[in-house]
Structures are given as structure tokens and as C-alpha cells.
């Protein structure tokens, strides 16, 4: 699904990092891990040290303050989770620093973070009907729902 064209004039300004070094586990209790330099995948781990640790940065929209928009970075790196298209793996994009302002096509770096109880959802700002998701025998990708798993638990203070 193509990004919504009206998003191009919405500007997102970086606020601050709101979470450091957390792990994302899906509903099957699989942790997100590095598949290779570019992609992520999910696996059941005995040792959580192998799981990817993420930082979460918050952005404010010029359009509306009430919605929580975030960027996901692999801790202690300059790699950022970047959305592609539906059923395509999310990419790890290297950037020298966290973007101070994001607009237009760069919104593929941003996600709406929604919590409900222990469930966390990350909807792509560029593709508002698609979530960060895990899929059996596949990379972490963007998906609209089942059979992909779109809800995650955040595990904090693992360091």
C-alpha cells in the first residue's frame, strides 16, 4: 500500500529518547534478533542477551500532539528500523544521528506506538494500516494482521 499522500506536509520533531535498551517479545514469546546486517527476525531464546536491545525516541507532530509517534533504534548503534511495503521486511537503516525533523518520505522511520495492557503495537506512519510484525520462518516485516503477529511485549531493564 502506498504511503498516504497527505502525510507529506506533516512535520515530526524529535523530543527525546524515552526508553533505552528494551527487548521486544511477540505473542509467541519470541524475541526479536538480528538476522543479518539488514534484517531482523524472531526466535525463542533461552538467553535474552542474544535479543536485540532497542531505544525508543519520541516525536511530536505539527498536526496533532495526542498521538505517540516514535522511532526505533538498535541500542548502541546508528541503525534505525525502517518500514518498506506490506509483507516486506523492515530494514535497518544507518544514519549518523537521530533525525531532528522528519517529514515526507522519511516517515517510513516513524511508528505510532499504541499500548493496551501488556500489548504494544507499532503502526507505520507511512503505511497507517500496517504494523511491525513477526511471521513464521520470515523476517520482521510490515503486516496488516494474522497470520503475522503484531502485538509485542516490552521487556525493560535487561542490561
Amino acid at each position: 500500500s502506498a504511503p498516504f499522500s497527505f502525510l507529506s506536509n506533516v512535520k515530526y520533531n524529535f523530543m527525546r529518547i524515552i526508553k533505552y535498551e528494551f527487548i521486544l517479545n511477540d505473542a509467541l514469546n519470541q524475541s526479536i534478533i538480528r538476522a543479518n546486517d539488514q534484517y531482523l527476525t524472531a526466535a525463542a531464546l533461552h538467553n535474552l542477551d542474544e535479543a536485540v536491545k532497542f531505544d525508543m525516541g519520541a516525536y511530536k507532530s505539527s498536526k496533532d500532539d495526542a498521538k505517540i509517534t516514535v522511532i526505533l533504534r538498535i541500542s548502541k548503534t546508528q541503525l534505525y528500523v525502517t518500514a518498506q511495503d506490506e509483507d516486506q521486511p523492515v530494514l535497518l537503516k544507518e544514519m549518523p544521528e537521530i533525525p531532528k525533523t522528519i517529514t515526507g518520505s522519511e516517515t517510513n522511520l516513524l511508528f505510532f506506538w499504541e499500548t493496551h495492557g501488556t500489548k504494544n503495537y507499532f503502526t507505520s506512519v507511512a503505511h497507517p494500516n500496517l504494523f511491525i510484525a513477526t511471521k513464521q520462518d520470515y523476517w520482521v516485516c510490515l503486516a496488516g494482521g494474522p497470520p503475522s503477529i503484531t502485538d509485542f511485549q516490552i521487556l525493560e531493564n535487561q542490561a
Epitope: 523530543m15 526508553k19 496533532d64 505517540i68 499504541e114 499500548t115 495492557g117 497507517p128
Partner: antibody, heavy 118, light 113 residues
Framework: QVQLVQSGAEVKKPGSSVKVSCKAS????????ILWVRQAPGQGLQWLGG????????DHAQDFQDRLTITVDESMTTAYMELSSLRPEDTAIYYC???????????WGQGTLVTVSS | DIVMTQSPDSLAVSLGERATINCKSS????????????LAWYQQKPGQPHKLLIY???TRESGVPDRFSGSGSGTDFTLTISSLQAEDVAVYYC?????????FGQGTKLEIK
Amino acid sequence: QVQLVQSGAEVKKPGSSVKVSCKASGGRFTNYAILWVRQAPGQGLQWLGGIIPIFDETDHAQDFQDRLTITVDESMTTAYMELSSLRPEDTAIYYCATGSNSYYGLYWGQGTLVTVSS
Amino acid sequence: DIVMTQSPDSLAVSLGERATINCKSSQSVLYSSNNKNYLAWYQQKPGQPHKLLIYWASTRESGVPDRFSGSGSGTDFTLTISSLQAEDVAVYYCQQYYSSPYTFGQGTKLEIK
């Protein structure tokens, strides 16, 4: 699952303040918004204000802007709502709620009756 | 402020029949950037904590019987109980969480006819 336990009923004089606590057991407020809502006798629900602790941002209904203070302790397990310059019409049951980072209530406290009377 | 108006104020429905409660917002609660309606429905019974039934206008909360459903978009929303049970007697509230202040409807009292 988070359970919210609020402090007990209070009787206050007009002009005084009340501070109601809301303790989360089985979890913390870290990833959630906390909303405070009241219900006057025989009336509906009125949103007073709220806080998203991870942003350290509070939000208040205009009518309560100058009288309402909402805070969360450092452990992110107890939220507080303080209402000052109380008047008889502030007599109500005060509720806290949380469970999402949007301002709706998945988990609700049992309510705290605040009576303002001379 | 967004004003939430429920109708009717009270409703009497026979057991097993369908109950429909409407909620109208004075402005849209649909956030175009993520295509979601920021609307929730609650059930309030005397002496019990409030119970979230529906969020995002149509997502049923876990554990809520499937006879409860939410629908609508923009400014017009509906809570439907497909087959009324005795335990559904309560007051029902809609709430918008789109913009501050996050307002509630005045409530609809549901009784058995």
C-alpha cells in the same frame, strides 16, 4: 494485570485541598497514560485531567487548570490527584484509570468519595 | 471541546432482543494519519469498577462477550448488544480520546422491558 487501589473517602471543608492516591499493583504506569475522572451524585463521568509519565506531560480540563495537580511517584507505581480551593460542587467520586498510552481507561480504580461540606 | 451526545438517555429492551445506543461527537474523532477512531465504550454497574467494552470504536476488549459490538466512524458511533442478557443492565458511556479534554457522553441507562 494491573489493579488500581485508591485512597479512602475524604470529608473536606470548602476552600481546602484534597489529595487522592492511586496505587498500581501488578504493574507500573511506565507505558501508560493515567486519567482522572469524577462522577458527581446522580451525574455522568467528567474527565479532569491526566498524565503520561514517560513524557512527564500533564493535561487538564480547562475548568480545573488552576486547581488540579497530577503527579506520579518516581517508582511509577502511585499516581496522585490534588484538587485545591474545594467547593461543595466538587463533591463526587473520583476515579483513576490507566492501561493504554491513549487517554482511555482499561483498568479503573474503585473510586474515592470526596465530600465537601462546611 | 468535543461534545459527546448519547441517545437515548434511557432504553428498555426485552431479554434476547437487540439494544442499540448511539453516540455523536461534535467533531470528527477519526485521526487521518492512522485511520483510527479514538472512541471507547464503557459499562458502569452500581458498586463495580467501570468496564471497558470497546476501544478504537470497534475493537472488543478481551473477555467482553461477543454480543457487544461497536461500529461507526468520524462523528457517529453505535454500541450494539445483539441479544440482551439480564447482566447487561447498566449505564453505558462513550468517550472520545482524540483531543483534550477527553470528554464522555452523558450516559445511557439500559433496563429490561
